[in-house]
Amino acid sequence: HNTTVFQGVAGQSLQVSCPYDSMKHWGRRKAWCRQLGEKGPCQRVVSTHNLWLLSFLRRWNGSTAITDDTLGGTLTITLRNLQPHDAGLYQCQSLHGSEADTLRKVLVEVLADPLDHRDAGDLWFPGESESFEDAHVEHSISRSLLEGEIPFPPTS
């Protein structure tokens, strides 16, 4: 899986979208999890409604919401009141039994509020960008991460 970078601004909301094949994942609940450490598990943050037919209903866990357009094939996660500690590597998952398929790997970056910037010429607008082409970077971030190996945060 490539990793997609989503950049948001501290104090604001960030919407993360995870497209998927609606037929292939028909009837499956979805989840949003956070990668704990370089080789740690992906810890569940929030999942869609227990009844798949009600997946369109927004479910919250703290400041994170999830909703699933099962016909259009788009899972949407909203991170409200984004803070620096929300930065991290996440996954959108499709659940089947005790297994989880990764729909998308997402790197969330939290930037300082651009309204604080003194030099408007330096402003640039956060959003979504596909992971970079550099094969080494891709490999270093997209390799298989095994559960339970290194607790977060990793030690040197």
Epitope: T3, V5, G40, H85, G88, L89, H136
Partner: antibody, heavy 121, light 107 residues
Framework: QVQLVQSGAEVKKPGASVKVSCKAS????????IHWVRQAPGQGLEWMGW????????TSAQKFQGRVTMTRDTSTSSAYMELSRLRSDDTAVYYC??????????????WGQGTLVTVSS | DIQMTQSPSSLSASVGDRVTITCRAS??????LAWYQQKPGKAPKSLIY???SLQSGVPSRFSGSGSGTDFTLTISSLQPEDFATYYC?????????FGQGTKVDIK
């Protein structure tokens, strides 16, 4: 072991720019943010900002907006901090430091040895 | 910006003493607090993250506690190599800010 090695001391004139390098080794460079912190002579620590070596994304403290540019070169596992329009009060030791969190912001764990930048006419 | 206030600014202690340094944030920062040790002419060394978790390789005589606005760094039995300046830092809100430092010297 994880190590950050910085470039040597610099002497600059007011109005000039300085570029400090920070070469990482012993870990996956693109997996951990690099912070820049400075310390004026006899003073405390001041956070300047960070760069995410994976994406190249940066954020800096308002005080340095428009003057600081943070970049990285993944091929050499190096991060760079350039400060422009130098003033005498920019005289300080500049440190790079690795964040402890994997692609996250979790406080720093390893620091470079520091680079003394002296601004004097 | 969040102001981090350390107290005392300096203290004199003897080897074997129990030393406590406090750090107060001007607003709540949960447990997003780190502690650092710095010796003259050297780079800071990370001691504690997440208010109370010890960094790898740091002696167990160092401990941290607190949450919200009030935090404490404790050295249970001061050793000769512990004479240094200690800084707290919050990483809850931009810009990340440090306390002004607490210098621990020999009595």
């Amino acid at each position: 072991q994880v190590q950050l090695v910085q470039s040597g001391a610099e002497v600059k004139k007011p109005g000039a720019s300085v570029k400090v390098s920070c070469k990482a080794s012993g870990y996956t460079f693109t997996g951990y943010y690099i912070h820049w912190v400075r310390q004026a002579p006899g003073q405390g620590l001041e956070w300047m900002g960070w760069i995410n070596p994976y994406s190249g994304g940066t954020t800096s403290a308002q005080k340095f907006q428009g003057r600081v540019t943070m970049t990285r070169d993944t091929s050499t596992s190096s991060a760079y901090m350039e400060l422009s329009r130098l003033r005498s009060d920019d005289t300080a030791v500049y440190y790079c430091a690795r964040d402890a969190g994997y692609l996250a912001l979790y406080g720093t764990d390893v620091w470079g040895q520091g680079t003394l930048v002296t601004v004097s006419s | 910006d969040i102001q981090m206030t350390q107290s005392p600014s300096s203290l004199s202690a003897s080897v074997g003493d129990r030393v406590t340094i406090t750090c107060r944030a001007s607003q709540g920062i949960s447990n997003y607090l780190a502690w650092y040790q710095q010796k003259p002419g050297k780079a800071p060394k990370s001691l504690i993250y997440a208010a109370s978790s010890l960094q790898s390789g740091v002696p167990s005589r160092f401990s941290g506690s607190g949450s919200g606005t009030d935090f404490t760094l404790t050295i249970s039995s001061l050793q000769p190599e512990d004479f240094a300046t200690y800084y707290c830092q919050q990483y809850s809100t931009y810009p990340f800010t440090f306390g002004q430092g607490t210098k621990v010297d020999i009595k």
